[in-house]
């Protein structure tokens, strides 16, 4: 059997409301995956699993199952939210977050994500983990890769 | 520190236009809203706008659509007002402030730039 | 517009004595994120407006302990409790809840 490759593309949107009262950040995170079949046969993608860590908190978790099957030597891209919430100690960031006066509140995020296929009974998994940014203040839509934190990503100076 | 620092007082004729500088130091320029009050004499603070030097978008009060223009260039990290066809309402002084973060209020503020209207 | 109303106008006051302004908008301040834009500025003749009291009732850094804001929705008020010298000018409330920003018409606060 080819490799099944599996490419994390980065945060597509993310979608805000709170909690007033709760001080609460709710998040829904979309993310997008290339999953890429190299073999001359059918792969099932059986199931993905994510989650989001802030600060080494998870902070949301999500998994879709029977999600598609990729065709051989064929492509497909695929788009999972995982809904976060930052509260309880984390609610100091409601402060940060509901700043009016700042236009762009970015926080990094760790986006985990474990794509299991199956072909011929055989199962694989594959695991990505990348540090994203995400706007906490307000909806956004991002270009693909846009959000990306490369500065975790370089070495210590 | 923070120090924003704006032009000299103008002295100008009816139906021409006026261009205020404001610029800012002693902070991230770019990452600021910086906003444009108005005060005539004897009067009180008039909110005319804000301008986010870091990609140039603006905020306008309604009242100054049309008379006020603001504009900013990150280079010089200075922020501008153009008033255009002035007349004797549009003497004043005009202050920029900036948006503190944390504060979430205008607390720093030019020394203000008078404009004077007359023939 | 919201509309900052101020009172008094002026407010004569010996030295020592205790000040009291307030400010009520023509509708709620709360924004939907919660938090209350209602603030307080003084400007002393020929200079620039400076920043007191931010959120109903923050002091600013480098104010002094004897300004203290308070209120809620629409009703606001600023307190000296022992006027000095140096305090003496016109007090603004602002709102930057709702577009456009608005300020009250200011108080003057003056020795007896």
């Known amino acids: 059997p080819r490799s099944i490759d599996v490419k994390y593309i980065g945060v597509k949107s993310a979608y805000v409301s709170y909690d007033v009262q709760k001080r609460t950040i709710y998040l829904n995170i979309t993310n997008t995956l290339n999953i890429t079949n190299n073999n001359y046969y059918s792969v099932e993608v059986e199931n993905i699993t994510a989650q989001v860590q802030f600060s080494k908190t998870v902070i949301g978790k999500a998994r879709l199952n029977n999600i598609t099957i990729i065709g051989p030597l064929d492509m497909k891209q695929i788009d999972y939210t995982v809904p976060t919430v930052i509260a309880e100690e984390m609610s100091y960031m409601y402060d940060f977050c509901t700043l009016i006066s700042i236009k762009v509140h970015n926080i990094v995020l760790m986006m985990q994500v474990t794509v299991t296929t199956t072909y011929f009974g055989h199962s694989e998994q594959i695991s990505q983990e990348r540090y994203q940014y995400v706007d906490c203040g307000r909806n956004t839509t991002y270009q693909l890769g846009q959000s990306e934190y490369l500065n975790v990503l370089q070495p210590q100076q | 520190q923070v120090q924003l620092q704006q032009s000299g007082a103008e002295l100008v004729k009816p139906g021409a236009s006026v261009k205020i500088s404001c610029k800012g130091s002693?902070?991230?320029?770019?990452?600021?809203?910086m906003n444009w009050v108005k005060q005539r004499p004897g009067k009180g603070l008039e909110w005319i706008g804000q301008?986010?030097?870091?990609?140039?978008?603006?905020n306008y009060n309604g009242k100054f659509k049309g008379k006020a223009t603001l504009t900013a260039d990150k280079s010089s990290t200075t922020a501008y007002i153009h008033l255009s066809s002035l007349t004797s309402e549009d003497s004043a002084v005009y202050f920029c402030?900036?948006?503190?973060?944390?504060?979430?209020?205008?607390?720093?503020w030019g020394q203000g730039t008078s404009v004077t209207v007359s023939s | 517009d919201v509309v900052m109303t101020q009172t008094p106008l002026s407010l004569p006051v010996s030295l020592g004595d205790q000040a009291s302004i307030s400010c009520r908008s023509s509708?709620?301040?709360?924004?939907?994120?919660?938090?209350?834009?209602l603030h307080w500025y003084v400007q002393k003749p020929g200079q620039s407006p400076k920043l007191l009291i931010y959120?109903?009732?923050n002091r600013f850094s480098g104010v002094p302990d004897r300004f203290s804001g308070s209120g809620s929705g629409t009703d606001f008020t600023l307190k000296i409790s022992r006027v000095e010298a140096e305090d003496l000018g016109v007090y603004f409330c602002?709102?930057?809840?709702?577009?456009?920003?608005?300020f009250g018409g200011g108080t003057k606060l003056e020795s007896k």
């Open positions: 602002s709102q930057i809840t709702h577009v456009p920003w608005t």
């Open positions: 301008i986010y030097p870091g990609d140039g978008d603006t």
């Open positions: 402030a900036r948006w503190g973060h944390y504060d979430e209020a205008m607390d720093d």
């Open positions: 509708q709620s301040l709360v924004h939907s994120n919660g938090k209350t834009y």
């Open positions: 959120k109903i009732s």
């Open positions: 002693g902070y991230a320029f770019s990452s600021y809203w």
